[in-house]
């Protein structure tokens, strides 16, 4: 009885089970009752990658430089040529017949996976705590600056597109400014005291001094802000006095309206 099915690596033709041609070879003639299947090797620029009964080998793929392609792996009689894209480009499809430039991740997005010759850039939105302020095919989302590690505080919150803005802490500023101001005041006070002492010791020209009761001198009266009825003079951080603006009444602890 003629066979209805053949073994692996065989095919049925004219009631005969014939051997398939091995990879890298094409079919020249089917087997007969008296002869084996005849196969011939594929030529230099051709291939067949399976056990087959093909009468023609397939042409190797051409990696067209005009389409941005280059050879990644040269074809053999058993394998096709593998093309890939030039730097900065990736394949448009799985078959890689042409190439397109890698896309850039816009601000607010970072590179999750850098593009290869066969895959495009994969972008991801920058999560909270990260930002990207550039359009790039390489840069990942960067973490916000940590103000704490620099002994600073956040003055402006970060976004997915901007970093945080750091500034000095209020307490820290006070710790620096107050001792400086106190130091300056102390020096001024000393100078005033020395000056007053000198003035007090100066003898009157020829005029005899009438006997007077010792008078308590209140040095504080001469100091700014010692008169509760007088307006308080504003000062800048640098301890410089601010002159009262013309046309404005002096008011204590009254906030100006914006």
């Amino acid at each position: 009885e003629p066979p209805t099915a053949c073994r692996e690596k065989q095919y049925l033709i004219n009631s005969q089970c014939c051997s398939l041609c091995q990879p890298g070879q094409k079919l020249v003639s089917d087997c007969t009752e008296f002869t084996e299947t005849e196969c011939l090797p594929c030529s230099e620029s051709e291939f067949l990658d399976t056990w087959n009964r093909e009468t023609r080998c397939h042409q190797h793929k051409y990696c067209d430089p005009n389409l941005g392609l280059r050879v990644q792996q040269k074809g053999t009689s058993e394998t096709d040529t593998i093309c890939t894209c030039e730097e900065g480009l990736h394949c448009m499809s799985e078959s890689c017949e042409s190439c397109v430039p890698h896309r850039s991740c816009l601000p607010g997005f970072g590179v999750k996976q850098i593009a290869t010759g066969v895959s495009d850039t994969i972008c991801e939105p920058c999560p909270v705590g990260f930002f990207s302020n550039v359009s790039s095919a390489f840069e990942k989302c960067r973490p916000w600056t940590s103000c704490e590690t620099k002994d600073l505080v956040v003055q402006q919150a970060g976004t997915n597109k901007t970093d945080v803005v750091c500034g000095p802490q209020d307490r820290q500023r006070a710790l620096v400014v107050i001792p400086i101001c106190l130091g300056i005041l102390f020096v001024i006070l000393l100078l005033v005291l020395v000056f007053i002492k000198k003035v007090a010791k100066k003898p009157n020209d020829k005029a005899p001094h009438p006997k007077q009761e010792p008078q308590e001198i209140n040095f504080l009266d001469d100091l700014p802000g010692s008169n509760p009825a007088a307006p308080v003079q504003e000062t800048l951080h640098g301890c410089q006095p601010v002159t009262q603006e013309d046309g404005k009444e002096s008011r204590i602890s009254v906030q100006e309206r914006q």
Epitope: S19, V28, S29, D30, T32, E33, F34, T35, E36
Partner: antibody
Framework: EVQLQESGPGLVKPSQSLSLTCSVT?????????WNWIRQFPGNKLEWMGY???????NYNPSLKNRISITRDTSKNQFFLKLNSVTTEDTATYYC?????WGQGTSVTVSS | DIVLTQSPLSLPVSLGDQASISCRSS???????????LNWFLQKPGQSPQLLIY???NRFSGVLDRFSGTGSGTDFTLTISRVEAEDLGVYFC?????????FGSGTKLEIK
């Protein structure tokens, strides 16, 4: 159905050449198979002489040395046997065959 | 060359009997692909040989299942299960594994 038919002279003089034609119908000799010449001597002994393949290449029985030539005419779907320098020992019935199909044979006598 | 030795040279049988013919090769007929190109032919009186069995055991189209072939390597057998009058003639084995192709000397099947 595949059919083969031999033709040629029935009588050849010694030292001359024997030329036979095989006409094939029902199958192209360029498609596949080996197209053989076989002879049968008196007393039934069979001898394979040689073949021409579908692609035109040949293979001959070394016993026939350089006396044998098998050619073909693909336009007429025919193949040919030429045997040079015949002797009386070449007297036989000559068959052309694809092996699964045979011609009816032609008797050739070598005699002066 | 491969020598094929057939036995017996003559086989007298009664109609309806089983007949077995042996063909021994001087070397293995199995090729590198594992195929064995050993064939059996019947030549009826006044006719050209006709193919019965190819590749040891495969019946050619139209051949009755009374005919079967077995064997491997160098030993092969053709068996006719129930001989009929139309089976009479000379049986040949032929190997086409190696060039030159060679025939057995033939076995004549005749009525007792």
């Amino acid at each position: 159905e595949v059919q083969l038919q031999e033709s040629g002279p029935g009588l050849v003089k010694p030292s001359q050449s024997l030329s036979l034609t095989c006409s094939v119908t029902g199958y192209s000799i360029t498609t596949n198979y080996y197209w053989n010449w076989i002879r049968q001597f008196p007393g039934n002994k069979l001898e394979w002489m040689g073949y021409i393949k579908y692609d035109g290449s040949n293979n001959y029985n070394p016993s026939l040395k350089n006396r044998i030539s098998i050619t073909r005419d693909t336009s007429k779907n025919q193949f040919f046997l030429k045997l040079n320098s015949v002797t009386t020992e070449d007297t036989a019935t000559y068959y052309c065959a694809r092996l699964d199909y045979w011609g009816q044979g032609t008797s050739v006598t070598v005699s002066s | 060359d491969i020598v094929l030795t057939q036995s017996p040279l003559s086989l007298p049988v009664s109609l309806g009997d089983q007949a077995s013919i042996s063909c021994r090769s001087s070397q293995s007929l199995e090729n590198s692909n594992g195929n064995t190109f050993l064939n059996w032919f019947l030549q009826k009186p006044g006719q050209s040989p006709q193919l019965l069995i190819y590749k040891v055991s495969n019946r050619f189209s139209g051949v009755l299942d009374r005919f079967s072939g077995t064997g491997s390597g160098t030993d092969f057998t053709l068996t006719i299960s129930r001989v009929e009058a139309e089976d009479l003639g000379v049986y040949f084995c032929l190997q086409v594994t190696h060039v030159p192709f060679t025939f057995g000397s033939g076995t004549k099947l005749e009525i007792k």
